[in-house]
Interface confidence: low
C-alpha cells in the first residue's frame, strides 16, 4: 500500500489529524521534500547575519554576514570578524602579522614567507606583512650564456617594506 503522505508535495505537510490531508506549511516554515509530517522552522538571519535568500514554503532562508564579517562553517553557520590584509584574528582581536609572516586576505592566519634559499633561489621581492616573498632564479641560472634575466636585487634577509 502506498503511503498517502507520499503525495504531499514540498511546501506542505501531511496532517495526521485530518486524514492525511496535505496542509500548507505555517508561516515562517518550509518543507523541502514531499511526504513530510511537519514543517521545519525557517532560519532567521539576525544580528551579524544578513539575509541572502528569503525563506519560502519549499526552501530555507540563506544567510551571509554583514560587511566587516565573513562566513565560516557549512551554510554560513558563523560570522567571523574581518581583519585587514597583513593581520590575523586572535582572541584579542586583529593583530599585525609577526615578522616573517604575511596574510594577503581579510580572513585566515598569517603564513610564513617562502624561504627562497631552501630551493637554492635568491629573493627577488622581499616579503611584507601583506605579501609573500618572491623568489628569483638561482645564482647558477644567472651564469654567462644563460638566457637573459633582470638580475635580482642583492640577496639579503627579507624584511618588511618601510611602512
Amino acid at each position: 500500500l502506498q503511503d498517502p503522505c507520499s503525495n504531499c508535495p514540498a511546501g506542505t505537510f501531511c496532517d495526521n489529524n485530518r486524514n492525511q490531508i496535505c496542509s500548507p506549511c505555517p508561516p515562517n516554515s518550509f518543507s523541502s521534500a514531499g511526504g513530510q509530517r511537519t514543517c521545519d522552522i525557517c532560519r532567521q538571519c539576525k544580528g551579524v547575519f544578513r539575509t541572502r535568500k528569503e525563506c519560502s514554503s519549499t526552501s530555507n532562508a540563506e544567510c551571509d554576514c554583514t560587511p566587516g564579517f565573513h562566513c565560516l562553517g557549512a551554510g554560513c553557520s558563523m560570522c567571523e570578524q574581518d581583519c585587514k590584509q597583513g593581520q590575523e584574528l586572535t582572541k584579542q582581536g586583529c593583530k599585525d602579522c609577526r615578522f616573517g609572516t604575511f596574510n594577503d586576505q581579510k580572513r585566515g592566519i598569517c603564513q610564513p614567507w617562502t624561504n627562497c634559499s631552501l630551493d637554492g633561489k635568491s629573493v627577488l621581492v622581499n616579503g611584507t606583512k601583506e605579501s609573500d616573498a618572491v623568489c628569483g632564479p638561482s645564482p647558477a641560472d644567472l651564469s654567462p650564456g644563460a638566457s637573459s634575466v633582470t638580475p635580482p636585487a642583492p640577496a639579503r634577509e627579507p624584511g618588511h617594506s618601510p611602512q
Epitope: 496532517d15 489529524n17 505555517p26 523541502s32 509530517r37 511537519t38 514543517c39 521545519d40
Partner: antibody, heavy 117, light 107 residues
Framework: QVQLKESGPGLVAPSQSLSITCTVS????????INWVRQPPGKGLEWLGV???????NYNSALKSRLSISKDNSKSQVFLKMNSLQTDDTARYYC???????????WGAGTTVTVSS | DIQMTQTTSSLSASLGDRVTFSCSAS??????LNWYQQKPDGTVKLLIY???SLHLGVPSRFSGSGSGTDYSLTISNLEPEDIATYYC?????????FGGGTKLEIK
C-alpha cells in the same frame, strides 16, 4: 503504534551533566520534530527545545547555553544533554513528537531527574 | 519571549457542569495555540490545536475558541475522567511557551 520512551540517570550531582535518551517507534525522525519539555515538582510545563526533521534545533532562550539536542535517525533516538545542573533542574523530563502545525501530538511518559549531592 | 498566563490556578466544578479555562498571551499569537491535558499520573495528551481544531480521538465535549491574545478551552459536560491539569501553549514565536496550568477538581 507510535511511542516515545525517555531514559535517564535518575540522580545527578550538582554541577554535573545530564544525558537523556528518547527512543521512538512507529514513525521516522526524518519526518517529525521532537520536542523536550520538563516539569519541576508541583510546577507547570516548560518547553526546553526542538529538534527538527532536517536536524536543526531551537532552544528555550533561558537554557540555550546549557542545552544540546541531537539524534541518531538510524537508531530512532534523540538525545538531550544539559550541562552545569543545579537543584532547580530537578524535574520530570518529557519528549514529545512535533507534528503538523507544531502541536505535540504524542508524549512519552517522562523520566524523573533529581539533582542532589 | 511570549508570556502565557492562565490566571486561575485551580477550578472546582461538579460532574455535568460546563467548565471554561482561560489563557492570555502577552502579545497577539494569531490563533497559534494548543491545549494539553495532564492527568494526575503525569500522562500528557493533546486536546486542541490551532485554537479550535479537535485532536483525533478527543471527545466532542471539548472545544476551543479565541483570537488575538485571549483564548479559552471549554468542557461542555464534565466527566470524572476529565479531572486533570490543563495547559495552553503558543507556537506563534519561538521559544514556544506554556501557560502555568489550571487544575480541575470535582466538587
Amino acid at each position: 503504534q507510535v511511542q516515545l520512551k525517555e531514559s535517564g540517570p535518575g540522580l545527578v550531582a550538582p554541577s554535573q551533566s545530564l544525558s537523556i535518551t528518547c527512543t521512538v517507534s512507529g514513525f521516522s525522525l526524518t519526518s517529525y520534530a521532537i520536542n523536550w519539555v520538563r516539569q519541576p515538582p508541583g510546577k507547570g510545563l516548560e518547553w526546553l527545545g526542538v529538534l527538527w526533521p532536517g536536524g536543526g534545533t531551537n532552544y528555550n532562550s533561558a537554557l540555550k547555553s546549557r542545552l544540546s539536542i541531537s539524534k541518531d535517525n538510524s537508531k530512532s533516538q534523540v538525545f538531550l544533554k544539559m550541562n552545569s545542573l543545579q537543584t532547580d533542574d530537578t524535574a520530570r523530563y518529557y519528549c514529545a513528537r512535533g507534528s503538523g502545525t507544531w502541536y505535540f501530538d504524542v508524549w512519552g511518559a517522562g523520566t524523573t531527574v533529581t539533582v542532589s549531592s | 519571549d511570549i508570556q502565557m498566563t492562565q490566571t486561575t490556578s485551580s477550578l472546582s466544578a461538579s460532574l455535568g457542569d460546563r467548565v471554561t479555562f482561560s489563557c492570555s498571551a502577552s502579545q497577539g499569537i494569531s490563533n497559534y495555540l494548543n491545549w494539553y491535558q495532564q492527568k494526575p499520573d503525569g500522562t500528557v495528551k493533546l486536546l486542541i490545536y490551532y485554537t479550535s481544531s479537535l485532536h483525533l480521538g478527543v471527545p466532542s465535549r471539548f472545544s476551543g475558541s479565541g483570537s488575538g491574545t485571549d483564548y479559552s478551552l471549554t468542557i461542555s459536560n464534565l466527566e470524572p475522567e476529565d479531572i486533570a491539569t490543563y495547559y495552553c501553549q503558543q507556537y506563534s514565536k519561538l521559544p514556544w511557551t506554556f501557560g502555568g496550568g489550571t487544575k480541575l477538581e470535582i466538587k
